[in-house]
């Protein structure tokens, strides 16, 4: 059941998001989530994961990229990018000339 909280050993992760009460948190895994909301610049949030491990396997889109790892402070220096959007008139691999 993907919604069930993990009961394995906990790992310490860097916590950098509006929900953090301090610089680290403890969870089943560490996360970095890069999110771009409509009309805003992307925000990169670091924290802990305990639920929905399936999100870790999601492919990056132009709006979200979800990264997970399983070791001590492994999310600290991770930097993510969003999937680039391809204008409909251009094909990948062309230089527009």
């Amino acid at each position: 059941d993907p919604v069930k909280p993990s009961r394995g050993p906990l790992v310490t992760c860097t916590c950098e998001s509006p929900h953090c009460k301090g610089p680290t948190c403890r969870g089943a895994w560490c996360t970095v989530v890069l999110v771009r909301e409509e009309g805003r610049h992307p925000q990169e949030h670091r924290g802990c994961g305990n639920l929905h491990r399936e999100l870790c396997r999601g492919r990056p889109t132009e709006f979200v990229n979800h990264y997970c790892c399983d070791s001590h402070l492994c999310n600290h220096n991770v930097s993510l990018v969003l999937e680039a959007t391809q204008p409909p008139s251009e094909q990948p691999g062309t230089d527009g000339q």
């Epitope: 916590c15 950098e16 509006p18 610089p23 925000q43 990169e44 670091r46 600290h76």
Partner: nanobody, 125 residues
Framework: QVQLVESGGGLVQAGGSLRLSCAAS???????MGWFRQAPGKERDFVGA????????YYADSMKGRFTISRDNAKSTVFLQMNSLRPDDTAVYYC???????????????????WGQGTQVTVSS
């Protein structure tokens, strides 16, 4: 509500030093606290920032070696030590705070959710 209060600005002679402080209240933790400055008629420029989780400071190239950012964890206060000041350092210095950190945007004003009112620094020749 969150408040950032800067202090320590003033008038100093070229070659002198100042130490600015920024005290945060209304929230216990920020991921990043930074300093920006704005000279009359110019854009607001990045000075430096400190990442709270590891205490690593990042600086604008032109400030490296002269300016140092540090923090007091217990008081949610960040400091900007400015040495070898020059007349072109004259500006209003702003403290800024963000609930997150990004390697690609820590030097941009848009990453910061909260701003202080600013403190005037004037360097005379």
């Amino acid at each position: 509500q969150v408040q950032l209060v800067e202090s320590g600005g003033g008038l100093v002679q070229a070659g002198g030093s100042l130490r600015l402080s920024c005290a945060a209240s209304g929230r216990t933790f920020f991921a990043t606290m930074g300093w920006f400055r704005q000279a009359p008629g110019k854009e607001r420029d990045f000075v430096g920032a400190i990442r709270w989780s590891d205490g690593v400071a990042y600086y604008a190239d032109s400030m490296k070696g002269r300016f140092t950012i540090s923090r007091d964890n217990a008081k949610s206060t960040v400091f900007l030590q400015m040495n070898s000041l020059r007349p072109d350092d004259t500006a209003v210095y702003y403290c800024a705070a963000s609930t997150y950190f990004s390697f690609t945007t820590y030097y941009t004003a848009r990453m910061y959710d909260y701003w202080g009112q600013g403190t005037q620094v004037t360097v005379s020749s």
